[in-house]
């Protein structure tokens, strides 16, 4: 359990840099994370909205806080979900 946990952790931390990348090859991963964010009401992988770098402006609606019942914070003048997605992803992987 702890070994697989460590592998998942390392993989997610490693892939954080893909969110701020601008190449075509990273787009598929970014789009998958965007869908995940909208479903689980979270933002980014490790550092929240900052993980997206300059892409934060590129994707409309990114991390947009649509649910007032969830913790939100201001980032670049916009309300975004406060919780990062890492714990949600780990839970999701564990269940599936």
């Amino acid at each position: 359990k702890s070994k697989s946990d460590r592998i998942v952790n390392e993989t997610l931390y490693e892939n954080t840099k893909l969110l701020s990348a601008t190449g075509e090859s990273e787009k598929q991963f970014q789009e998958a994370i965007i869908v995940f964010q909208e479903e689980f009401k979270c933002c980014g992988l490790v550092n929240g909205a900052a993980d997206w770098g300059n892409n934060f402006q590129h994707y409309p609606e990114l991390c947009a806080c649509l649910d007032k019942q969830r913790p939100c914070q201001s980032y670049n003048g916009k309300q975004v979900y406060k919780e990062t997605c890492i714990s949600f992803i780990k839970d999701f992987l564990a269940k599936n």
Epitope: E31, I34, V35, E38, E39, F40, K41, Q57, P60, E61, A64, C65, L66, D67, K68, Q69, C72, S74, G77, K78, Q79
Partner: antibody
Framework: EVQLLESGGGLVQPGGSLRLSCAAS????????MSWVRQAPGKGLEWVSA????????YYADPVKGRFTISRDNSKNTLYLQMNSLRAEDTAVYYC?????????WGQGTLVTVSS | QSVLTQPPSASGTPGQRVTISCSGS????????VTWYQQLPGTAPKLLIY???HRPSGVPDRFSGSKSGTSASLAISGLRSEDEADYYC???????????FGGGTKLTV
């Protein structure tokens, strides 16, 4: 080319029901949140409802809460709006739009008339 | 009564510059990005400006948007007859957990 095509509008009596559909093409439907926006004759735009890409989250405007239900079938690339207990004030052109807070593509709309 | 306030009408002559304002509060414009839509007579609305000042591809650079505090504005320079339309501002309202539009501004050229 992104296309959104609404259908299901028509004349219905107060208290009646109607189900609107929106057929989407030209993009990966399951990657996007979707919304319904309406416009009463000669009036401005009014947001109705939104749904997340995987249907996990739905959002409604206060005037339609408890009466309207938004849903989607990603295998059919189709968005739905089930409208119950319809009132005269629900009379409008109903537009289907891509995304939930930046509506980047719109359908041409379908007219719903609630009248006795 | 719309949550966002826009002037009902605006006008200008060809070549002129016109500005349309959109006023809100801390729970909508003050904390979320503003979007502008153009609705030509008898047609569906079209995205004009998103994230306060970004133009989608295909929208001429004559259209520009800005936001300051709880207000936003749309500027149209080099006005043309085909710009005659209704213009709506919109944003998410964090208090309502819903999307809100301005009442719309009818632009006459």
């Amino acid at each position: 080319e992104v296309q959104l095509l609404e259908s299901g509008g028509g004349l219905v009596q107060p208290g009646g029901s109607l189900r609107l559909s929106c057929a989407a093409s030209g993009f990966t439907f399951s990657n996007y949140a979707m919304s319904w926006v309406r416009q009463a004759p000669g009036k401005g735009l009014e947001w109705v409802s939104a749904i997340s890409p995987g249907s996990g989250n739905t959002y409604y405007a206060d005037p339609v809460k408890g009466r309207f239900t938004i849903s989607r079938d990603n295998s059919k690339n189709t968005l739905y709006l089930q409208m119950n207990s319809l009132r005269a004030e629900d009379t409008a052109v109903y537009y289907c739009a891509r995304r939930s807070s930046v509506f980047d593509y719109w359908g041409q709309g379908t007219l719903v008339t609630v009248s006795s | 009564q719309s949550v966002l306030t826009q002037p009902p009408s605006a006008s200008g002559t060809p070549g002129q510059r016109v500005t349309i304002s959109c006023s809100g509060s801390s729970s909508n414009i003050g904390s979320n990005d503003v979007t502008w839509y153009q609705q030509l007579p008898g047609t569906a609305p079209k995205l004009l400006i998103y994230s306060n000042s970004h133009r989608p591809s295909g929208v001429p650079d004559r259209f520009s948007g800005s936001k300051s505090g709880t207000s936003a504005s749309l500027a149209i320079s080099g006005l043309r007859s085909e710009d005659e339309a209704d213009y709506y501002c919109g944003t998410w309202d964090s208090s309502l957990s819903g999307y809100v539009f301005g009442g719309g501004t009818k632009l006459t050229v």
